[in-house]
């Protein structure tokens, strides 16, 4: 039975040209997190963190994505095209699969409001 819940950074905004941390957290379960997939709004995979095998950053994002912190993902050199939904998919044993959603809005530098907790200066 799946008892866990995914907590995410929710809706966040960041400056064009800046960086942002995408972060999810799985709670209320003793299940082991075996893999986390990070997916973009068009369903393309950005990166995978496998507990046994390590990180894989997909080639299209190698220059702009950094693994971590933790199971999160750091998206750098933001462009307006990065605006949209991001999904974290937690594959766990023995529970199964949990999925979280984050909405990122990339703003022109002059109007950006951002959440200090998940923003990189």
């Amino acid at each position: 039975m799946m008892t866990g819940t995914i907590e995410t950074t929710g809706n966040i905004s960041a400056k064009k040209g800046g960086s942002v941390i995408l972060q999810c957290h799985l709670s209320s379960t003793m299940a082991q997190v075996t893999q986390v997939n990070w997916e973009q709004h068009d369903h393309s995979l950005l990166a995978i963190r496998n507990a046994e095998l390590g990180w894989h950053i997909y080639p299209a994002f190698k220059d702009r994505v950094a693994p971590g912190p933790g199971l999160g993902l750091t998206l750098q050199s933001l462009t307006m095209n990065d605006t949209g939904e991001y999904f974290c998919t937690y594959h766990t044993y023995p529970d199964g699969t949990y999925r979280g959603r984050i909405f990122l809005e990339v703003l022109e530098s002059s109007v950006a409001e951002h959440s200090a907790r998940f923003q990189i200066p």
Epitope: Q32, T34, Q35, N37, E39, H43, L45, I48, N50, A51, E52, L53, G54, H56, Y58, T89, H91, T92, Y93, P94, G96, T97
Partner: antibody
Framework: QLQLQESGPGLVKPSETLSLTCTVS??????????WAWIRQPPGKGLEWIGS???????YYNPSLKSRVTISVDTSKNQFSLKLSSVTATDTAVYYC?????????????????WGQGTMVTVSS | EIVMTQSPATLSVSPGERATLSCRAS??????LAWYQQKPGQAPRLLIY???TRATGIPARFSGSGSGTEFTLTISSLQSEDFAVYYC?????????FGGGTKVEIK
Amino acid sequence: QLQLQESGPGLVKPSETLSLTCTVSGGSISSSRYYWAWIRQPPGKGLEWIGSIGTSGSTYYNPSLKSRVTISVDTSKNQFSLKLSSVTATDTAVYYCAIEGANFRDFGYVAFDIWGQGTMVTVSS
Amino acid sequence: EIVMTQSPATLSVSPGERATLSCRASQSVSSNLAWYQQKPGQAPRLLIYGASTRATGIPARFSGSGSGTEFTLTISSLQSEDFAVYYCQQSPPWPRTFGGGTKVEIK
């Protein structure tokens, strides 16, 4: 390129424990970040995943077999093994060892990349 | 547990013709799907991973497509060595599960 070779008795009596070993050559089992897996195939039937063990020692088992399965790694012998207890005739199958995730770092996928040739195990009195 | 269903169970095709094999997942597996080929008396061999990417050394006549719950393996022009059983498999959700297989036989 890593290679795998299964070994163990070809005949096991009902209610006994089936024990198989997979010997890894072409690389060190202790320095490899993979899943080491066991898969079986009853005669004339499809493939069934039995379980896997990660480099960390974490084990993952098929729920239908979990109460009877143990998978372990012996780094000193460059081997990993399968034990299946309380066997019956329905456990008669070709048993394969396999490596999962050998190309993960390069290509980002988790699949059974490398297989042993398989060993036939018959459960009969 | 994610159940993988393959169809048809048997496919009769003439050499040189196209073969289309289907695999359906009971719930979405995104693009986390692999295809294997197994010939009599041999271990399976990885053909396709990530639903559509050919494994090393696999000829271009093999192609995979699909995402979510519906997947297809296409062999564009069957060669004599392609007559075998083909299995789909989902990963990384636990437990790993395989489809029941499609046997591609000579018509």
